[in-house]
Interface confidence: medium
């Protein structure tokens, strides 16, 4: 019985198409596959950012794979050929590993890269990113932002920078068509006559950084002699009602009765005739059914109801 062996894939490489972190891993079939013409060869691919404890593992019949990486760090990947048990009279055969790495040669010291990068997708409509210049960089340093997401032909540069003292410190993005629920890649690089500037890479999904507008049209309705219903409306904009959680803060005279998270646009209180004044404010956030994370809106305008007028249904703003 001769031992069955198979070679690793050939020409294994990581290709950077210029999408700011979305990379292609590609390879060619192994040499000497002639003995296994009747077989469908598979490949086991493992890859990770250098420094990560866990490998991502993919088994595929294709000769390529695409995924997103953090280009602030290097990338390592390895692949081997798998011959299924059907081809080898009963036991799976694996080749040795072919390995490759990829990294962008860093320019400049880490302190020169942008600091405190912060991106907010206002009301699921307008993306705005802001940053602070690197530590110790001179005023001649300028930063440029590039972005890409699946659907764009190539990475685009920001066309509407926010400036302070002549330096770019933020970007107002144009309308981003079909850009949510997918990775959004950003690179902020820089230039200076004085010294090289380190680039920074960021990846997020837009639906997870939404800051909605606050709820509107806050009202009180007396449901019965001892019940008052607080109501409000979803903020204007594209976010559907099913995507909201609310936090409501209710004050009675000088005391905060409740700060509670609610899923609907109503909240009911049982009151007594002694209540002199009720006030409430509400804020909104995208909920777990529509995103993995989000940012609370600002608080709504306060709506108050004077206790003396509770029976008369007088509203105060």
């Amino acid at each position: 019985d001769t031992e069955i062996k198979v070679n690793p894939p050939q020409d294994f490489e990581i290709v950077d198409p210029g999408y700011l972190g979305y990379l292609y891993l590609q390879w060619q079939p192994p040499l000497s596959l002639d003995h296994f013409k009747e077989c469908t060869v598979e490949y086991e691919l493992k890859y990770r950012n250098i420094g990560s404890e866990t490998w991502k593992t993919i088994i595929t019949k294709n000769l390529h794979y695409k995924d997103g990486f953090d280009l602030n760090k290097g990338i390592e990947a390895k692949i081997h050929t798998l011959l299924p048990w059907q081809c080898t009279n009963g036991s799976e055969v694996q080749s040795s590993w072919a390995e490759t790495t990829y990294w962008i040669s860093p320019q400049g010291i880490p302190e020169t890269k942008v600091q405190d990068m912060d991106c907010v997708y206002y009301n699921w409509q307008y993306l705005l990113c802001s940053w602070k210049p690197g530590i110790g960089v001179l005023l001649d340093t300028n930063y440029n932002l590039f972005y890409w997401y699946e659907g764009l032909d190539h990475a685009l540069q920001c066309v509407d920078y926010i400036k302070a003292d002549g330096q770019n410190i933020g970007c107002r993005f144009p309308y981003l068509e079909a850009s949510d629920y997918k990775d959004f890649y950003i690179c902020v690089n820089g230039s200076s006559e004085n010294k090289p500037i380190r680039s920074s890479y960021f990846t997020f999904q837009l639906q997870n950084i939404v800051k909605p507008l606050p709820p509107v049209y806050l009202t009180f309705t007396r449901e019965s002699s001892c019940e008052i219903k607080l109501k409000w409306s979803i903020p204007l904009g594209p976010i559907p009602a099913r995507c909201f959680d609310y936090e409501i803060e209710i004050r009675e005279d000088d005391t905060t009765l409740v700060t509670a998270t609610v899923e609907n646009e109503t909240y009911t209180l049982k009151t007594t005739n002694e209540t002199r004044q009720l006030c409430f404010v509400v804020r909104s956030k995208v909920n777990i059914y529509c995103s993995d994370d989000g940012i609370w809106s600002e608080w709504s305008d306060k709506q108050c109801w004077e206790g003396e007028d509770l029976s008369k249904k007088t509203l105060l703003r």
Epitope: E252, D253, D254, T255, T256, L257, L269, K270, T271, T272, E274, T275, L278
Partner: nanobody
Framework: AVQLVDSGGGSAQVGGSLKLSCTAS????????MGWYRQAPGKKREFVTS???????TYPDSVKGRFTISLDNAKNTAYLQMNSLKIEDTAVYYC???????????????SGPGTQVTVSS
């Protein structure tokens, strides 16, 4: 100093009842309100109910119609009557003062040490 001591927790069957108590000291109880929060393992703190000095009560949908909060000013004690208990009511329950700008009430929220409520089928 403001002090809250909560008690009455324990185990109950689904559909059963428990009554929690919270005795306060260190401030004028009758001039202030009281509330309860709860926290289940691995979950965020959740508001359960509150009652103001005027008797205004508020309940989220998750407990409305099943839980009732009341005050006994003579005993400086608040009570939380929990009926028709569900598995998802399992948590540590904390009684709390209500933050107030009034001079006779605590300015910030104080909590009791908590009491475990376990509901099983």
């Amino acid at each position: 100093a403001v002090q809250l001591v909560d008690s009455g927790g324990g185990s109950a069957q689904v559909g059963g009842s428990l009554k929690l108590s919270c005795t306060a000291s260190g401030y004028i109880f009758s001039s202030c309100g009281m509330g309860w929060y709860r926290q289940a393992p691995g979950k965020k703190r959740e508001f359960v109910t509150s009652v103001s000095k005027y008797g205004t009560t508020t309940y989220p949908d998750s407990v409305k119609g099943r839980f009732t909060i009341s005050l006994d000013n003579a005993k400086n004690t608040a009570y939380l009557q929990m009926n028709s208990l569900k598995i998802e009511d399992t948590a540590v329950y904390y009684c709390t003062t209500l933050a107030s700008r009034g001079t006779t009430c605590p300015a910030s929220v104080y909590s009791g040490p908590g009491t475990q409520v376990t509901v099983s089928s």
